[in-house]
Structures are given as C-alpha cells and as structure tokens.
C-alpha cells in the first residue's frame, strides 16, 4: 500500500500529460485524482511511465472502481492491461468487439497470457455463443486459439462462424475437438460444390465418419497424404482398397511410406493381401489368402 | 539489422562542453516501440545510466547525477546527442548509446554501441 | 533511487563449470530484471530481459530467474566465449539502474 500523504504546492495534476513522468511513486499517488486519470486513459499510453508508476495509476483505478472498471476505461487501458490480473479481468463486463481487440493488441506478439484467456473467456460467456467476427478477431491474434478451447466449448460455435477459420487455425487440434467442429464445417459448406467443398472441409476431416470418407472417395478430391494420415483410424479400417485409392488418387503410392504408421498400418492389417497387392506398392501385413474374416463387434451388436 | 555507434571527441578540457553523438543505421529513430538512452561506465566502476530521449522528444535526465546532461533527437540524420556543458575529471568514462525496449514502458536495453572513451584533462 | 547489489564481483572458472551470479535488488522490481554481457572494445549484449526471458539468439546455457529481489543468471556449461563481465539492470523505476558487475575469468 502506498502511504497517504499530502500533495506538494504546485504539483497538483490538472491533466494527464508528459510532466507527471518525473512525479515520485508518493507524489503520482498524492496529486493525480483517479477520476481525472480514468476520464483521460487515452493519454497514458502516449507517456513514458515507468512500471512502478504504472502500479500506482492502476492502483487508483482500483480505489476508484473496486467493482471492476466500466468499459469506458477498459477501452483505454492500452498496455495498463498488462498490469492487471485475472482476478481484476473477472469484475469486468466486456462487450464491445472494438474494446476486446485494443486489449488483444496490447499484447500482439506474445503468448496468450492468463490475463488474456481470462479476457477472451469474460468476452465469449458475456456474448453466450462465439460468433463469426469474434472467431475473426480471436484467431487473427491466436490462430491456435480454437484449439485451445474444450469440445464443451466448442459446442457453442455456430455453425457460420466456422467460414473465419483457416487450416492453420486447426493445426493442434486434437480428434476429441474435431469431432465438434466436423459436424460444423459440414453445415457451413453444404452448399458449396465438390471441389470447392473439399478445399474448406479438408482441415476438418479429422472428425469425419467412415460413410462422409466413402462419399468423399467417390469425388475424385485426391486427398494428400498429411491429411490422410490426420483422419480417425476407426473412421479409415472399414475403408476398402478401392476406397482408399480413390480418395487419394494420385497420392495413394504415399501409402508406402508410411506403412508402419497409424491410421495406414492399422488400415494394412485389415485388408486381403490380394487388394492391397493391386495397388503395386508393395504394402505388406494384410490377411492371407484363403483366411476368413469374422467382424466380431458386428456379431456382437446381433447377441 | 540495427546498429549505433557513438562520436565526438576523446579528449575535453576540464570546464569545456562535451558533445557526444549516436548515429543509428539500419532502422528509423522515430519509430515506435523504442526510447534511445546514454550510459556511462567510470573507469573500472560501475554503469550508470544517464538518461533517455524518446522519438516524440520527451526526456529523463538521471537526477542523482551531479552534472547537468541535455539530450536531443535528430531525426532527418537519424541521431541523438548528449551535451554537457562544464565538464570536469569526474565525467571521465566510456560513454554508450543503447536503444530501449518499450514494453507498455521503457524496459532493457536491446542494443548498444560500442563506447567511446571521453577523457577531461587539460 | 533503488540500488542493485550483485555478487560475487569476480570469480574465476573453467570450461565447462556451471556459473551461478546473483543479483539483490533494494526494494520489490517484480520481474523487471535485465542481464548483460561486457566484453572490452565490444558493444554490451542483452543475454536476459524480464529476469528469465532469453533475448532472441543467446545461447541456452544462459537462464536467468527470480522475482522481487533475488534474482540469479545461470551459465550451465560455461565456453571459451562467456568470459567477460555481467551486469543486472533493474528497469522498474527511474533512474534506471545497474549492479556493479561480476567479472567471469579463466581458472
């Protein structure tokens, strides 16, 4: 806590300006009125203050405003943000985009800090759902932000949102998160023809079923390996040969490579021998001619 | 990549004016996110900061420095100076220029000159 | 003004010997602790800045922690190229200030 003590003659701040940069820690406390600092927030981030004078005005919007700040000044904080914690972010109730992007600016370039996931989480459950410019805006700054989200979050995004979302944007996604925003993406596209439909979806297809993959293969898309390798493995087993090289057109001889790999190893040990051999790749491991094949989860679901 | 290299003379006589000056290459003074800062290191002693310009010309002298320091910006030669009038044995050192971050305020020094040793004696 | 104390003011050690120097700041800085590197007739270097972040194309063997008033920067397997002199910085408050600097020399 900072001692009370009274202002010096004179040094009373009629404004936020330049001269207050050589005020002492007691002196910024003593004779700058909080009411004042919050009514010209603008002006701070254009003066050089040190962080220890940073602390005293964030302090004396903190006496001023024990409740949280009102937006007004929250618009303005500028790198004063940087100095709050997630438990100041909590008071706050945040709704305009334009405030929530001058905050996110503030610290561009960096890690998403707990100040921030605060801000973001404070400014999505204010909205109720994650709408389309706020996906913009959320991704613009953290293109790994939805991933970061749980699949009960993702739950929330509507479906048109999913038209901000690039491919790097998915990148760490896991399959659980990709479960969510398949079903999604599919909605948002539907409208779209065959090979425009396949560039947006294509990101997505880590959470597609076996039936989407087997439409899909009937499409000539040429799937590319890396996606390919990124699909549910129980999603790709019950795939045929056929299927398989379809889908990936021109792309199936990168089956080779990557043979002892999940899905393609897991996808080998379930087909004849004698279809994977008419692919001419050399793949190994399927089942032996003359061997049957028992689908035991199918006998099961009859019992 | 940003260079600064200090100039001015190596020797000053005790009551004469220093003038010291910071050239920065391969970046603009008068962007933002920067402040432009003198330090000074006492022959085997300590560094000591003696103060900053900022590129909207707002400056800081260090006050616990006895002598009166003036810093100026130029920003059509890209440069900034330090002048100090009536120097005396004491403002003997190795004088650097460094560009600061500006982090939310001025933080670290990011990049420095190499120094240039002024000497006062008659 | 706050005063940085850092020692020890030299020590000596060999190629590959960890190298522990600290830092004690006169009052609570937070994490607004900076390390530098001093070598003669050489322009100084930024090693460290917000008292753990390596500055872009340091070497890993430099680490730094700490926060409030104890602070330490950690060579992990010192090189022929680490021997010169370090500083911390405290850029918290004006006037800025640093400590009086460890001079790492060869055993």
């Known amino acids: 806590e900072v001692e009370k003590t009274a202002c010096p003659s004179g040094k009373k701040a009629r404004e936020i300006d330049e001269s207050l940069i050589f005020y002492k820690k007691w002196e910024l406390e003593a004779c700058v009125d909080a009411a004042l600092l919050a009514t010209q927030m603008d002006r701070v981030n254009a003066i050089p203050f040190t962080y220890e004078q940073l602390d005293v005005l964030k302090h004396k919007l903190d006496e001023l405003y024990p409740q949280g700040y009102p937006e007004s000044v929250i618009q303005h904080l500028g790198y004063l943000f940087l100095k709050m914690s997630p438990e100041d972010i909590r008071k706050w109730n945040v709704t305009s985009l334009e405030t929530l992007k001058a905050l996110l600016e503030v610290n561009k370039g960096h890690e998403m800090s707990p100040q921030v996931a605060t801000l973001i989480d404070r400014f999505v459950k204010g909205r109720g759902q994650l709408d389309k410019d706020t996906l913009d805006t959320l991704t613009a700054f953290y293109p790994g932000y939805l991933c970061s989200l749980s699949p009960e979050e993702l739950s929330s995004v509507p479906p048109s949102s999913i038209w901000a979302v690039r491919p790097q944007d998915l990148d760490t996604c896991d399959p659980r998160q990709l479960d969510v925003l398949y079903p999604k993406a599919r909605l948002a596209f539907q409208n779209m023809n065959g090979s425009e439909y396949f560039v947006k979806i294509q990101s997505f297809l880590g959470g597609a079923p076996t039936e989407d993959l087997k439409a899909l293969s009937q499409q000539n898309v040429s799937m590319d390996l890396a996606t390919f390798m990124k699909l549910r493995t129980d999603a790709v087993l019950p795939l045929t040969v056929a299927e398989v090289q379809k889908l990936l057109g021109p792309h199936v001889e990168g089956l080779k490579a990557e043979e002892r790999h999940r899905p393609v190893r897991d996808w080998i040990l379930r087909q004849r021998q004698d279809d994977l051999d008419t692919l001419g790749l050399g793949l190994q491991g399927g089942i032996p001619n003359g061997y049957l094949v028992l689908d035991l989860s199918m006998q099961e679901a009859l019992s | 990549q940003v260079q600064l290299q200090e100039s001015g003379p190596g020797l000053v006589k005790p009551s004469q004016t220093l003038s010291l000056t910071c050239t920065v290459s391969g970046g603009s003074i008068s962007s933002g996110g920067y402040y432009w800062n003198w330090i000074r290191q006492h022959p085997g002693q300590c560094l000591e900061w003696i103060g900053y310009?900022?590129?909207?010309?707002?400056?800081y002298s260090n006050p616990s420095l006895k002598s009166l320091f003036t810093i100026s910006l130029d920003t059509s030669k890209n440069q900034f100076s330090l002048k100090l009038s009536s120097v005396t044995a004491a403002d003997t050192a190795v004088y650097y220029c460094?560009?600061?971050?500006?982090?939310?305020?001025?933080?670290?020094?990011?990049?420095w000159g190499q120094g240039t040793m002024v000497t006062v004696s008659s | 003004e706050i005063q940085m104390t850092q020692s020890p003011s030299s020590l000596s050690a060999s190629v590959g010997d960890r190298v522990t120097i600290t830092c004690q700041a006169s009052?609570?800085?937070?994490?607004?602790l900076n390390w530098y590197q001093l070598k003669p007739g050489k322009a100084p270097k930024l090693l460290i800045q917000?008292?753990?972040s390596l500055q872009g194309g340091v070497p890993s063997r430099f680490s730094g922690s700490g926060s409030g008033t104890d602070f330490t920067l950690t060579i992990s397997s010192l090189q022929p190229e680490d021997f010169a002199t370090y500083y911390c910085?405290?850029?918290?408050?004006?006037?800025?200030?640093f400590g009086c600097g460890t001079k790492v020399e060869i055993k």
């Open positions: 910085q405290q850029s918290y408050s004006t006037p800025f200030t």
């Open positions: 917000a008292a753990s």
């Open positions: 009052q609570d800085i937070s994490n607004y």
């Open positions: 310009i900022f590129y909207s010309g707002i400056t």
């Open positions: 460094a560009r600061g971050l500006v982090r939310g305020a001025p933080d670290a020094f990011d990049i």
